[in-house]
Interface confidence: low
Amino acid sequence: KESCDVQLYIKRQSYHSIFAGDPFKLECPVKYCAHRPQVTWCKLNGTTCVKLEGRHTSWKQEKNLSFFILHFEPVLPSDNGSYRCSANFLSAIIESHSTTLYVTDVKSASERPSKDEMASRPWLLYS
């Protein structure tokens, strides 16, 4: 029987390589059965995850999943780091794995790679 608990589908060691100055949407895939939970984003600072207050967030509803989106408008160099979403469900807190944003500061990059090159060379992870 399929669980009716809330599930957050951010995989361990997931990452996004992005550029400062670009818009970016960080998605937290959420699965729930009846009532949509309250979901929040936080940014890891050492061992604590600091809740992101007053940020532009939105929901996107799909057939099989919903997505709680954190908007970066635009991405700043200081957005580099690891993020986690958490859902408040039946008075319990369910936390996702963390996902990491690797921000390249265009000002310090000698030449900006193409999107295709970036997609094929997310070199900042595992390097």
């Epitope: 399929e2 669980s3 608990d5 361990r12 060691q13 799909e62």
Partner: antibody, heavy 120, light 108 residues
Framework: QVQLQESGPGLVKPSETLSLTCTVS????????WSWIRQPPGKGLEWIGY???????NYNPSLKSRITISVDTSKNQFSLKLSSVTAADTAVYYC??????????????WGQGTLVTVSS | EIVMTQSPATLSLSPGERATLSCRAS???????LSWYQQKPGQAPRLLIY???TRATGIPARFSGSGSGTDFTLTISSLQPEDFAVYYC?????????FGGGTKVEIK
Amino acid sequence: QVQLQESGPGLVKPSETLSLTCTVSGGSISSYYWSWIRQPPGKGLEWIGYIYYSGSTNYNPSLKSRITISVDTSKNQFSLKLSSVTAADTAVYYCARVILYSSGWSFDYWGQGTLVTVSS
Amino acid sequence: EIVMTQSPATLSLSPGERATLSCRASQSVSSSYLSWYQQKPGQAPRLLIYGASTRATGIPARFSGSGSGTDFTLTISSLQPEDFAVYYCQQDYNLPLTFGGGTKVEIK
């Protein structure tokens, strides 16, 4: 019934780029994650990477510098490009759909696979 | 990355016998992140078990999965002729997703 079909050249020369496309029929590519997996002749399975229909990707770090996975929702297709191939890239390449369960992922629908040989 | 090790590499059994296949992870993957697949020659893998113990749609009850942490088992209670194949375990606790090297179940 969802069906996946890989297509692309069966022979690629060393140092060139391998390009494969997976066409999804019997269902929409939207709202799912999709993956590429390969299997060298007589060996085990290796996960290459995945893409969500919105374009979000994650790649196997052992191949990351050479992979691009892209999606074309208008054609219900997603594609794999693997650059600078060598004989070690000779394998049957499978495309597969990810099923989400509890807090995990599995591959519930697979293409029949296409053998790509790297040889001059 | 998490390395998945399957044993034995080959299992020689007769139809009607019980098959026990082992999969060991190099680190704990919990019980929610382990799947089993069956692959016959010239065919794509077929999902049998997910979440370590839940049978996929259409999979007969003779297939069962168990285990948690680092040690997992696929059991085929009574081997049928169509069950002779290669079986793979797969973890998705961490990226990259990784598969075991496979166990071949052959007719004795």
